[in-house]
């Protein structure tokens, strides 16, 4: 089931998915002078039986001879409101993501695509927050998020992070900002969850996790 | 209590535009996705797409890619999709609906009616 | 595109009667969603994630299935129960729907 909303975001912090739950969607998108071919894929689907996952549909991007003035599935990252990319230190650490049934590994890129990724995550679906070079993390509890379903509503988890930045007096726990309640919209109640998560699991593999480039965007 | 109420009939000629508004109230507009679906006289549904108001983000079925564009105004808690190139065949009712999974508020429905 | 095929397309049923509409998805989906839809109103949620009753809906309404197969079944039919009925799936992108079933006066 498609999470229908946007991971939280948490100031001076990004995330990363470190592998994808089946039925996640990656859009095909090019970068700036080039455009999917006429008879191309619009997404990647993370798709898989029993012992193996993997992305169905190849993304493939072809020049634009003159400017393509065809609006596109999702805008190009050029063209979206506050779109950010944030590059961290070092490179993305390897993690064995065959020990995550049921989840696909990082796409490889493909030629000609766009700078950053856009997925369309799904319910059990986590992502790990980190902060932004600069500033260091101050927490509260685990620094993921996680999509839930409650009565046919999709909502992510507060992740418990505060990015302070380095120069600056650090907080105190019973100092820290208030944040969003960790459940998400105030609207959501808690009686009568229908997903479980992978939350076990990729935890451990969280704790692999070093210093990440992020660039995934989401919707 | 939640409502989202949408703009009145429209009569449009062939090649014309139409913007459609559907006006949030009763929860936090920025905290939800707003989608909107098409039902043709006498058929069925048929989702368009949807904006993330707080960002901007929009997704477009692929059908409607060309036809439909869907914006929102946070000031005033409104999503809008505005129709182009109109031809008969989008004479519909024109629905939004709130997301955050199944689609639990629906608008009125707007009639956009296509005619020469 | 994941397509949406319901049966029958129209029903005609009398009061009390137990009636059953399948819905059936080109793929497996994860969950089915059901709107109810009367003429001139928008659609109105009924069942979520395959078997939940929606807020306010009598339990005479049922939905069960899974994989690609699902039904909703109304125990016994009421006068306020005819209308038309669709399924939906929210399991991948485009959302879809199902062409509709008519459940109309015998």
């Known amino acids: 089931e498609l999470c229908d909303d946007d991971p939280p975001e948490i100031p001076h912090a990004t995330f990363k998915a470190m592998a994808y739950k089946e039925g996640t969607m990656l859009n095909c998108e090019c970068k700036r002078g080039f455009r999917r071919i006429k008879s191309g894929s619009l997404y990647m689907l993370c798709t898989g039986n029993s012992s193996h996952s993997s992305w169905d549909n190849q993304c493939q991007c072809t020049s634009s001879a003159t400017r393509n003035t065809t609006k596109q599935v999702t805008p190009q990252p050029e063209e979206q409101k506050e779109r950010k990319t944030t590059e961290m230190q070092s490179p993305m650490q390897p993690v064995d993501q065959a020990s995550l049934p049921g989840h696909c590994r990082e796409p490889p890129p493909w030629e000609n695509e766009a700078t950053e990724r856009i997925y369309h995550f799904v319910v059990g679906q986590m992502v790990y927050y980190q902060c932004v070079q600069g500033y260091r993390a101050l927490h509260r509890g685990p620094a993921e998020s996680v999509c839930k379903m409650t009565h046919g509503k999709t909502r992510w988890t507060q992740p418990q992070l505060i990015c302070t930045g380095e120069m600056e007096t650090s907080q105190f726990p019973g100092e820290e900002k208030p944040q969003a309640s960790p459940e998400g919209r105030p609207e959501s109640e808690t009686s009568c969850l229908v997903t479980t998560t992978d939350f076990q699991i990729q935890t451990e593999m969280a704790a692999t996790m070093e210093t990440s480039i992020f660039t995934t965007e989401y919707q | 209590q939640v409502q989202l109420v949408q703009s009145g009939a429209e009569v449009k000629k062939p090649g014309s535009s139409v913007k459609v508004s559907c006006k949030a109230s009763?929860?936090?507009?920025?905290?939800?996705?707003m989608h909107w679906v098409r039902q043709a006289p006498g058929q069925g549904l048929e989702w368009i797409g949807y904006?993330?108001?707080?960002?901007?983000?929009?997704l477009y079925n692929q059908k409607f890619k060309d036809k439909a564009t869907i914006t929102a105004d946070e000031s005033t808690n409104t999503a809008y999709m505005e129709l182009s190139s109109l031809r008969s065949e989008d004479t519909a009712v024109y629905y939004c609906?709130?997301?955050?999974?199944?689609?639990?508020?629906w608008g009125q429905g707007t009639l956009v009616t296509v005619s020469s | 595109d994941i397509q949406m095929t319901q049966s029958p397309s129209t029903l005609s049923a009398s009061v009390g009667d137990r009636v059953t509409i399948t819905c059936s998805a080109s793929?497996?989906?994860?969950?089915m969603h059901w709107y109810q839809q009367k003429p001139g109103k928008a659609p109105k949620l009924l069942i979520y994630?395959?078997?939940n009753l929606a807020s306010g809906v009598p339990a005479r309404f049922s939905g069960s299935g899974s994989g690609t197969e699902f039904t909703l079944t109304i125990s016994s039919l009421q006068p306020d129960d005819f209308a038309t009925y669709y399924c939906?799936?929210?399991?991948?992108?485009?959302?879809?729907f199902g062409q509709g079933t008519k459940v109309e006066v015998k």
């Open positions: 609906a709130r997301g955050g999974g199944v689609f639990d508020y």
């Open positions: 009763g929860y936090t507009f920025t905290s939800y996705r």
């Open positions: 904006i993330s108001p707080n960002k901007g983000y929009t």
């Open positions: 793929s497996s989906i994860s969950y």
């Open positions: 994630t395959t078997s």
């Open positions: 939906h799936q929210r399991s991948t992108y485009p959302l879809t």
